[in-house]
């Protein structure tokens, strides 16, 4: 489950912030299991960009469909 904060409850994003995401801070090096952490600026929270073959909010699950597809390609 990749839940989001209710944006309506938060103030508008500061005008100075232009990018949609930032690098996560060093404190979040272990936030994503198999992927890269990105800080979503407007939602003001970290998120994970999964490496190929992984899915889930934290890239914690192997993508079985990708595994099957890869093994079929080999055949």
């Amino acid at each position: 489950e990749n839940s989001t904060s209710p944006l309506s409850a938060d103030p508008p994003v500061a005008a100075a912030v232009v990018s949609h995401f930032n690098d996560c801070p060093d404190s979040h090096t272990q936030f994503c299991f198999h992927g890269t952490c990105r800080f979503l600026v407007q939602e003001d929270k970290p998120a994970c960009v999964c490496a190929s073959g992984y899915v889930g909010a934290r890239c914690e699950h192997a993508d079985l469909l990708a595994v099957v597809a890869a093994s079929q390609k080999k055949q």
Epitope: S3, P6, P11, A14, V17, P25, D26, V41, D44
Partner: antibody
Framework: VQLQQSGAELVRPGASVKLSCTAS????????MHWMKQRPEQGLEWIGR????????KYAPKFQDKATITADTSSNTAYLQLSSLTSEDTAVYYC?????????WGQGTTLTVSS | IQMTQSSSSLSVSLGDRVTITCKAS??????LAWYQQKPGNAPRLLIS???NLKTGVPSRFSGSASGKDYTLSITSLQTEDVATYYC?????????FGGGTKLEIK
């Protein structure tokens, strides 16, 4: 959108206590939750943090044997348990979650350790 | 990561422009917050991300960043601004705080 902490505690030396921090308006699974300590007339110290999504914790070395941080995602609540209490643990304890644009702190829980 | 607030106290007058500085020992990439604390009260978050003013905080407060140096400015000091101000880095754990700068009226 806020963090609501449990009420003040008066406990005996040697006892344990469990403080709570309940989030409203956001899901605690979205990011780490942190705990801080502030002794009377002193600065702020970081105790540790939890990743509520999986229970992974990290502590400052000086609190490793003193504090245990847990979380219950069904109630959107983080907890700080302090054990073997002494007068040195008398302080105000705060929970927090910080972002780039916004940050949230609880109002603090005053813990007094006294016989 | 060490956070150094060079002045532990500042003697100021009402209406003054006040600048409080904080230096990080390494680059923290603007993952910095400023807090105001009055005796007996919880810290009040003023600014996160070095420059983002929290909702409800008066616009006389502002934050800026240059390299490892961070500044909190108050354009025209009011009576209610007399307090201790702390900076905090949250780039990495352990989170660390400056020693605080106490504003005192001349």
């Amino acid at each position: 959108v806020q963090l609501q902490q449990s009420g003040a505690e008066l406990v005996r030396p040697g006892a344990s206590v469990k403080l709570s921090c309940t989030a409203s308006g956001f899901n605690i699974k979205d990011d780490y939750m942190h705990w801080m300590k502030q002794r009377p007339e002193q600065g702020l110290e970081w105790i540790g943090r939890i990743d509520p999504a999986n229970g992974n914790t990290k502590y400052a070395p000086k609190f490793q044997d003193k504090a245990t941080i847990t979380a219950d995602t069904s109630s959107n609540t983080a907890y700080l348990q302090l054990s073997s209490l002494t007068s040195e643990d008398t302080a105000v304890y705060y929970c927090s979650r910080m972002g780039l644009l916004r940050g949230y702190w609880g109002q603090g829980t005053t813990l007094t350790v006294s016989s | 990561i060490q956070m150094t607030q060079s002045s532990s106290s500042l003697s100021v007058s009402l209406g003054d422009r006040v600048t409080i500085t904080c230096k990080a020992s390494v680059h923290i990439n603007s993952w910095l917050a400023w807090y105001q604390q009055k005796p007996g009260n919880a810290p009040r978050l003023l600014i996160s991300g070095a420059t983002n003013l929290k909702t409800g905080v008066p616009s006389r407060f502002s934050g800026s960043a240059s390299g490892k140096d961070y500044t909190l400015s108050i354009t025209s000091l009011q009576t209610e601004d007399v307090a201790t101000y702390y900076c905090q880095q949250y780039w990495d754990t352990p989170w660390t705080f400056g020693g605080g700068t106490k504003l005192e009226i001349k």
